[in-house]
């Protein structure tokens, strides 16, 4: 069997290794009905064509049936995410059948061989489902396949091969290598179930992308842009581990999809919402916080079926751990004028004050240059529910775009020590909450004093619901 190694560094080498020769025919796929949350409980093995185990194991024909499909393995033993997912499904759906698809013999191989085995595993699952369909009361519509990494594509094959249509497939960071750009019949795709939802947490546009970048479902959700997950940076990993490695970072980000799904099962009262957007940069600018025309959705188990949509890319920010929910805000700041700005690019900071809580000081991420005499849009998110927003404190500081500009700025300052202060003029801030869809306008506390120098504070109070000005038509509030 393969020796263990880090998924990123050596997976690249794996793709070019010669095919291992199988010396013995090994059993391939087992179906383990998890009858208990306990990890040490052995569960019950279902056997195709044998009805007795169904009765002995207490398989409920009318209930929902979840098939959990693991991915490539370096250890030949189930990782703890699987135990957490089984436990969460049992907690949320007490009567459901939870089946772990054990394809370890075919997954504990060179990555390329495991990929080549996905089709046969998918076929085995389809045959099991076809056999179950022969039983009274069993409905394919009640079947939910949940596949992690390589397992997501196995689920796709199963959905493709089964007679009829599976109710739902959830792809948890479907594997990228050897699937990126593949034909729809050779990877997970929207045709594989009535509803296919996907979480992408480890995608990279440079280097090796462990997770698939392209959208492959009806809805494809990219938490934190689908790449760098909070709490998974090398610093976080090194901080929490005696011997942190890049392997741990990869595992953390790739596996985050599973934990987001588990979170959606166990923290039903704290659902995370994702918003449709054409790309990550537009989302970072705060442009995409609309819930009109099904443009927003819960993520994970609570996602609403949107069969009409195909390859709808959705984005959200998350916390570093459970519960992952954050509260998104779009902020529109109209910068009326710059004064003595030179080459300096401003960085804004806001503190939000609400009826429930106040936020920390939050930097406004600049995706593009700040435009003067124009409305600039930003995305802000808080980890706590602030309630209704009451006021906003704004500050800014100059951040040079380059060392050259910094040198120019310093030289300018040294030659003109009495250079008049740099100022921005901001009269109001428009805010939209992603979660409530409420729009609010905040006006400067002192309408006569709307200029702000670096390091100084400007306070804004809520002055109206909605965004419309007095001379415009009456304000409208969008509902989710």
């Amino acid at each position: 069997s393969p020796t263990p190694f880090g998924p990123e560094g050596q997976l690249a080498d794996e793709l070019h290794k010669p095919k291992a020769i199988q010396t013995e025919v090994k059993p391939s796929v087992r179906f383990n009905l998890r009858t208990s949350k306990d990890p040490e409980h052995e569960g019950c093995y279902l056997s195709l064509g044998h009805s007795q185990p169904l009765e002995d194991c207490g398989f409920n024909m009318t209930a929902k049936t979840f098939f959990i499909i693991h991915g490539w393995t370096m250890s030949g033993i189930f990782e703890n995410w699987l135990h957490k997912l089984v436990s969460a499904l049992h907690t949320r759906e007490k009567d459901a059948n939870v089946v772990v698809v054990d394809w370890l013999p075919l997954a504990h191989q060179l990555y390329t061989d495991a990929v080549n085995n996905t089709r046969v595993v998918g076929h085995s699952i389809a045959r099991m489902l076809d056999w179950l369909q022969e039983k009274d009361d069993f409905s394919l519509g009640n079947v939910h396949l949940i596949g992690y990494s390589l397992g997501a594509h196995v689920a796709g094959y199963a959905g493709n091969f089964v007679k009829g249509t599976v109710g739902r497939i959830t792809g948890l960071d479907p594997a990228g290598p050897m699937f990126e750009g593949a034909d729809i019949h050779k990877r997970l795709s929207p045709d594989d179930a009535d509803f296919v939802d996907v979480l992408h947490t480890y995608t990279r546009s440079f280097g090796l992308s462990i997770g698939i970048q392209m959208p492959v479902g009806h809805i494809d959700i990219y938490p934190n842009g689908g790449d760098f997950q909070p709490g998974c940076g090398l610093n976080d990993v090194l901080g929490s581990m005696a011997y942190g490695t890049i392997t741990e970072v990869v595992k953390c980000e790739h596996e985050r999809a599973v934990h987001l799904f588990v979170d959606s099962l166990v923290n039903q009262d704290k659902p995370s919402f994702a918003f449709q957007c054409t790309d990550s940069n537009r989302f970072k600018k705060g442009i995409c916080l609309s819930c009109r025309k099904n443009r927003c959705n819960s993520i994970g188990y609570n996602a609403k079926k949107m069969r009409n949509k195909r390859n709808s890319k959705m984005y959200l920010k998350t916390r570093a751990g459970m519960p992952f929910r954050v509260y998104h805000y779009q902020m529109k700041i109209h910068v009326f004028s710059y004064k003595n700005m030179g080459e300096i690019e401003p960085t804004f900071y806001v503190t939000l004050y609400g009826t429930n809580a106040d936020s920390q000081t939050l930097p406004l991420e600049i995706v593009e240059r700040i435009e003067q005499n124009a409305t600039n849009t930003f995305l802000v998110y808080t980890e706590e529910d602030l309630g209704d927003l009451l006021k906003i404190q704004l500050t800014w500081e100059g951040a040079s775009q380059s060392w050259y500009n910094l040198w120019k700025e310093l030289r300018s300052y040294l030659s003109q020590p009495h250079n008049p202060g740099r100022e921005l003029n901001i009269r109001r801030i428009r805010v939209k909450s992603g979660e409530t869809q409420r729009k609010l306008t905040f006006c400067a506390e002192d309408p006569e004093n709307t200029s702000i120098s670096p390091g100084r504070e400007l306070w804004f109070r809520k002055c109206r619901d909605g965004w419309r000005m007095k001379n415009e038509t009456s304000p409208t509030v969008e509902l989710p």
Epitope: K26, H41, G76, I77, P105, H108
Partner: antibody, heavy 120, light 107 residues
């Protein structure tokens, strides 16, 4: 009743190899994994590696990668661990233990241990 | 590898006492902590899994608790057969690792 019966004590010379056995009974052999643990004299326990009897897949602790080879014979429900190029450092008690299918499953049943002495 | 530290290597107590044995992990192990008892004849038994779940047949005077990196095993009302060595083990990450053991002896 679940039982893991290990082979008897061994006294071997440096450079030799030894194969320790662990016969399982009282449960379905392929439904759990078999793990091997080393306890040097008066010391703690060290995980050597495991084998999944269902298909023979193994995973070793990097430290024992070149020392231990794990195999199973499904027909007799027996797991084996071969230790090669023995040195005095390999003198220890070796245990086999049963474990469920998850990382987190505990070692719920243990063999009685096999004492290995390596001496010239 | 995750280091498991049992700071107390030896502990003396009397029959009927209540004792607590601690175990610390070098990183968060998500409650995947198991406790084992080793008798002087070398026999090893599972006591507690997943921090606090009592294994079948283990007396209720044994209990486990903890979270994150700090865990403990408590034996209330010590009986003669409880004098043994106790090991903790993490099941969070490969390779699985054990604490160095705490030897509980009669005072």
């Amino acid at each position: 009743e679940v039982q893991l019966q290990q082979s008897g004590p061994e006294l071997l010379k440096p450079g030799a190899s030894v194969k320790i056995s662990c016969k399982a009974s009282g449960y379905t052999f392929t439904d759990n994994t078999i793990h091997w643990v080393k306890q040097s004299h008066g010391k703690s326990l060290e995980w050597i590696g495991h084998i999944n009897p269902y298909y023979g897949g193994t995973n070793n602790n990097e430290k024992f990668k070149d020392k231990a080879t794990l195999t199973v014979d499904k027909s007799s429900s027996t797991a084996y661990m071969e230790l090669r190029s023995l040195t005095s450092e390999d003198s220890a008690i070796y245990y086999c233990a049963r474990k469920g299918i998850y990382y987190s499953s505990p070692f719920d049943y243990w063999g009685q241990g096999t004492t290995l002495t390596v001496s010239s | 590898d995750i280091q498991m530290t049992q700071t107390t290597s030896s502990l003396s107590a009397s029959l009927g006492d209540r004792v607590t044995i601690s175990c610390r992990a070098s990183q968060d192990i998500n409650n995947y902590l198991n406790w084992y008892q080793q008798k002087p004849d070398g026999t090893v038994k599972l006591l507690i899994s997943y921090t606090s779940k009592l294994h079948s047949g283990v007396p209720s005077r044994f209990s486990g608790s903890g979270s994150g990196t700090d865990y403990s095993l408590t034996i209330s009302n010590l009986e003669r057969e409880d004098f043994a060595t106790y090991f903790c083990q993490q099941g969070n990450t490969l390779p699985f690792t054990f604490g160095s053991g705490t030897n509980l002896e009669i005072k």
